[in-house]
């Protein structure tokens, strides 16, 4: 993989420790928390990033209506278990032996249980809806300009193949970005939509994961786009399994 050879850093992940101890003295970077080697030419998996974050010291168009099965990450931060490829393990447990099943983006998709809970497979999140609300601007954004700018962003900054940006919807002041990626569509080397969405979310929050970058500030044809709030909905290939108690809460 490529890390900046001169000063040996990881351009795509600041939550790493890098040293020239790779083959032939090449720069090798390992994720904080897990110590796993990361590929600095692409995005690091969300599981490794969450683990690193937990180890770090504290510091006219109709919009899409999320389906009834859409998940929102309400549980927040936890220290996840990652598999050898850096993916989330299907079952996650905390220190008090409370366990739950997660999807491929690490969001809980079942009720919490005990150590006897079984999660047979890691269910893939194949559809992500990023819902943004922007602050007042000089005027409404031109939809095609906004669409082009957001597609460019996901292609250039997050290295996500354009075919995975399914749509950009706009009804001032709401912007929705739809990412879709089925298991069958994702080829080796393709950035995962869950990882791209996580990098985007952190960028919007002013917590860029890229080395030496501040937060992401978007502009469309020169016009500053100041985001007021962000909501991300996750849709899995298999609907989540929650008890009726949760659904009626």
């Amino acid at each position: 993989h490529t890390a900046a050879q001169d000063n040996c850093t990881c351009p795509t992940n600041k939550m790493t420790v890098c040293s020239p101890d790779g083959p032939g003295g090449r720069c090798q970077c390992r994720a904080l928390g897990s110590g796993m080697a990361v590929d600095c030419s692409t995005l690091t998996s969300k599981c490794l990033l969450l683990k690193a974050r937990m180890s770090a010291p504290k510091n006219a168009r109709t919009l899409v209506r999320p389906s009834e099965h859409a998940l929102v990450d309400n549980d927040g931060l936890y220290d996840p278990d990652c598999d050898p490829e850096g993916r989330f393990k299907a079952r996650q447990c905390n220190q008090t032996s409370v366990c739950w099943c997660v999807n491929s983006v690490g969001v809980r998709r079942t009720d919490k249980g005990d150590l006897s809970l079984r999660c047979d497979e890691l269910v893939r999140t194949h559809h992500i809806l990023i819902d943004l609300r922007h602050r007042p601007t000089a005027g409404a954004f031109n939809h095609s300009d906004l669409d082009a700018e957001l597609r460019r962003l996901f292609r250039e900054r997050y290295r996500l193949h354009p075919k995975f940006v399914a749509a950009v919807h706009y009804e001032q002041p709401t912007i929705q970005i739809e990412l879709r990626q089925n298991t069958s569509q994702k080829a080796a080397g393709d950035v995962d939509i869950g990882d791209a969405a996580y990098y985007f979310e952190r960028d919007i929050k002013g917590e860029s994961l890229f080395q030496g970058r501040g937060g992401l500030d978007l502009r469309v044809r020169g016009e500053p786009l100041q985001v007021e709030r962000t909501l991300i909905y996750y849709l899995d290939e298999i609907p989540p399994k929650f008890s009726m108690k949760r659904l009626t809460a």
């Epitope: 601007t137 000089a138 919007i204 929050k205 860029s208 500030d217 020169g222 016009e223 100041q226």
Partner: antibody, heavy 119, light 106 residues
Framework: QVQLVQSGAEVKKPGASVKMSCKAS????????IHWVRQAPGQRLEWIGY????????KYNEKFKGRATLTSDKSASTAYMELSSLRSEDTAVYYC????????????WGQGTLVTVSS | DIQMTQSPSSLSASVGDRVTITCKAS??????LAWYQQKPGKAPKLLLY???SLETGVPSRFSGSGSGTDYTLTISSLQPEDFATYYC????????FGQGTKVEIK
């Protein structure tokens, strides 16, 4: 290199209007908005508003709505600010500024136009 | 509007001193914070953006930290050319500046 060159100092009477200019060079004028910021003697910097030369769209600080008018001339790569109904507290240095290429912070600034309002 | 409160409003220091200026926002600004240096009769100069990112050409003795509502500008070893007024600015919701901190020679 990027440059913002502002018009010269002005002395005005209360109730009058003043119009100042900001000529941009060294970059594509329509790529960025132009902000206007003022600084009264011994006071903090105060954002007035911005104009997007692409479409002449404007956004103002509520405090200046109705009194400040921002315009631009693409062919001359120049932005203008007019402030009407001047009062003594409008005595200040008025700056134009361009955003940073990566963020909404202000990277390049004009040298400032001093406006003195006095009877 | 988001209010920005800087402290102290002025400080006296000597060459070589470590100087810290703080800026508090009235609400979370998600690291959309810039620091500027201004010398008398001159326009402000951008030092840092995104709370921690150093603008090109700015000496590494300047650094920024913070998150949420609380941010800090640190000059690790004050140089003669650093005596000036420093302003913080938020750009999360429109643009507002702090009242400034004047760094004077002791």
């Amino acid at each position: 290199q990027v440059q913002l060159v502002q018009s010269g100092a002005e002395v005005k009477k209360p109730g009058a209007s003043v119009k100042m200019s900001c000529k941009a060079s060294g970059y594509t004028f329509t790529t960025y908005v132009i902000h206007w910021v003022r600084q009264a003697p011994g006071q903090r910097l105060e954002w007035i508003g911005y104009i997007n030369p692409n479409n002449d769209g404007t956004k103002y600080n509520e405090k200046f709505k109705g009194r400040a008018t921002l315009t631009s001339d693409k062919s001359a790569s120049t932005a203008y600010m007019e402030l009407s109904s001047l009062r003594s507290e409008d005595t200040a240095v008025y700056y134009c500024a361009r955003p940073h290429f990566e963020t909404h912070a202000m990277d390049y600034w004009g040298q400032g136009t001093l406006v003195t309002v006095s009877s | 509007d988001i209010q920005m409160t800087q402290s102290p409003s002025s400080l006296s220091a000597s060459v070589g001193d470590r100087v810290t200026i703080t800026c508090k926002a009235s609400e979370d600004i998600f690291n959309r914070l810039a620091w500027y240096q201004q010398k008398p009769g001159k326009a402000p100069k951008l030092l840092l953006y995104g709370a921690t990112s150093l603008e090109t050409g700015v000496p590494s003795r300047f650094s920024g930290s913070g998150s949420g509502t609380d941010y800090t500008l640190t000059i690790s070893s004050l140089q003669p050319e650093d005596f000036a007024t420093y302003y913080c600015q938020q750009y999360w919701n429109t643009w507002t500046f702090g009242q400034g901190t004047k760094v004077e020679i002791k």
